[in-house]
Interface confidence: low
Amino acid sequence: AGVFELQIHSFGPGPGPGAPRSPCSARLPCRLFFRVCLKPGLSEEAAESPCALGAALSARGPVYTEQPGAPAPDLPLPDGLLQVPFRDAWPGTFSFIIETWREELGDQIGGPAWSLLARVAGRRRLAAGGPWARDIQRAGAWELRFSYRARCEPPAVGTACTRLCRPRSAPSRCGPGLRPCAPLEDECEAPLVCRAGCSPEHGFCEQPGECRCLEGWTGPLCTVPVSTSSCLSPRGPSSATTGCLVPGPGPCDGNPCANGGSCSETPRSFECTCPRGFYGLRCEVSGVTCADGPCFNGGLCVGGADPDSAYICHCPPGFQGSNCEKRVDRCSLQPCRNGGLCLDLGHALRCRCRAGFAGPRCEHDLDDCAGRACANGGTCVEGGGAHRCSCALGFGGRDCRERADPCAARPCAHGGRCYAHFSGLVCACAPGYMGARCEFPVHPDGASALPAAPPGLRPGDPQRYL
């Protein structure tokens, strides 16, 4: 048993451009608090898996009001450590999630409103009893600086908090065969209760005579590292001659998962999938309740209605999973009609509608041509929500009010001269060229390049572009 301790040093804008706006304002003062979730192992766990090592919520920080015009500074923090007690052995490797929450202190009825400002996660190796480890994590434009450590609760000692220590029975020495408990030199190792030979570093026991292995170790005495090699069989104790693993018991043999948990082998060890109400490396810890803080992202925790469901998390909009840890992509349901752009704002969905459409889900088709007249014989065309006029020849512009100069774009190639005509434009080609736009050179022998000149027109004649 022991305690994981987290000390938040600062939370504020990270380096670089794009500093975030202060989360608080004079109109809406706020304060911060933090939440930490710990899971054993370095393996990528399912996002909704519970905080099997434990979770903790900080106190609220001091009330902060933004100074108008000032950039967001490091925000005032809650006092004290976040402490996550662990009842089992410290696993040595762990995953963490740290959430920074904002509590708005407006005048809304019914208490403050909470919103998640930032969420960082990582996987680390850490020996219990070691010094504070410092860390910096960034979430968007925010930066979180913190330190953490794991310490054993007496009488446990060691890197996994699995060795037990007791005060010396005599001032001068420990009992026969028992060593002093470094660094607690005034204490002695407790009498051996685990199976004889059980590795003090990699094994632990909760009952006399047993030897249970920490993640990454196997064998009856937890002395065999679980490794992958080029050998055919990835199991069993190491062969002294080849250095390879020879066939032997698999990590799931005998099912190390208690309380109906199911075991699956991983490259380094095994993993237990626990039934609801149990957690821990081997599903050995029971009774997850709302007091353990299993619901994330503002999920509402309520005690289950029967013994098989110790708690139920009811998730806020945008989150799902048994612990509200999985973000829902509500836009994947394509709620916006008529090509509208879906925006998931977390607290709500918004649809940004294309021109010509309106409504919360862009469901209303506006009549683009209603009340719109196209001048000079043009006709109104609805398309893609945008009003457009199809203009009669010789007219252009949005409403066909502009007289079109067909020659304005200089359509005649190779020095051809352009003449406006009631039905369009006519190009008078320079010598040596022909075609509607004077685009085809005339060969010296009088033959034209493809396509041929239409019958009845000599090369060099004005070409009418219809």
Epitope: G110, A113, C290
Partner: antibody
Framework: QVQLQESGPGLVKPSETLSLTCTVS????????WSWIRQPPGKGLEWIAY???????NYNPSLKSRVTISLDTSKNQFSLKLSSVTAADTAVYYC????????????WGQGTMVTVSS | EIVMTQSPATLSVSPGERATLSCRAS??????LAWYQQKPGQAPRLLIY???TRATGIPARFSGSGSGTEFTLTISSLQSEDFAVYYC?????????FGGGTKVEIK
């Protein structure tokens, strides 16, 4: 500040179905859990049911067989239907919003009195 | 279901005095408890949630304490507007249940 307004008939005959609607004054109906609570004259409060925009519902087991709760996000409304009513269902019916971090009720409608009588 | 029992049913207190209201759960509800105030002809108003956290806008004279099965609402110095009926409510288990109420009246 969001406001809730109950509406529906004040008098229902025995064995008929009581139907009430609660209108939410803003567009927050997709962001919260919504509930119905009732209070018989001179008595205490009884939770009836709640609904969430995703369709998740929960009912008081004592009323579950007779209650239906539904929600219409396009109209910012949620509704209650209580079938086979008797005189014991005479009460002030409140709609309320569930608080974000716990199933307490932070915003209430003013209540509507429903009398079951022939 | 969890039965919430409030005592006393009626509490007679003079303005300026301290009022202590009790709420007991038939089984542990952790800290998942709320307190409400209801005046005649009005809807209840949330005072306390999480057993001890005051809702926004609630005066500091209202305080809540307790966890598990025993809870207390204390009004340190009763004002004229505090005379009302007070209800506790648990939200630890289904169904959500309320206490029978304590009426605080002028002595």
């Amino acid at each position: 500040q969001v406001q809730l307004q109950e509406s529906g008939p004040g008098l229902v005959k025995p064995s008929e179905t009581l139907s009430l609607t609660c209108t939410v004054s803003d567009n927050s109906i997709s962001n919260y859990y919504w509930s119905w609570i009732r209070q018989p004259p001179g008595k205490g409060l009884e939770w009836i049911a709640y609904i969430y925009y995703s369709g998740t519902t929960n009912y008081n087991p004592s009323l579950k067989s007779r209650v239906t709760i539904s929600l219409d996000t396009s109209k910012n409304q949620f509704s209650l239907k209580l079938s086979s009513v008797t005189a014991a269902d005479t009460a002030v019916y409140y709609c309320a919003r569930l608080f974000n971090w716990g199933f307490a009720f932070d915003i209430w409608g003013q209540g509507t009195m429903v009398t079951v009588s022939s | 279901e969890i039965v919430m029992t409030q005592s006393p049913a009626t509490l007679s207190v003079s303005p300026g005095e301290r009022a202590t209201l009790s709420c007991r759960a038939s089984q542990s509800v952790s800290s998942n408890l709320a307190w409400y105030q209801q005046k005649p002809g009005q809807a209840p108003r949330l005072l306390i949630y999480g057993a001890s956290t005051r809702a926004t806008g609630i005066p500091a004279r209202f305080s809540g304490s307790g966890s598990g099965t025993e809870f207390t609402l204390t009004i340190s110095s009763l004002q004229s507007e505090d005379f009302a009926v007070y209800y506790c409510q648990q939200y630890n288990n289904w169904p959500l249940t309320f206490g029978g109420g304590t009426k605080v009246e002028i002595k």
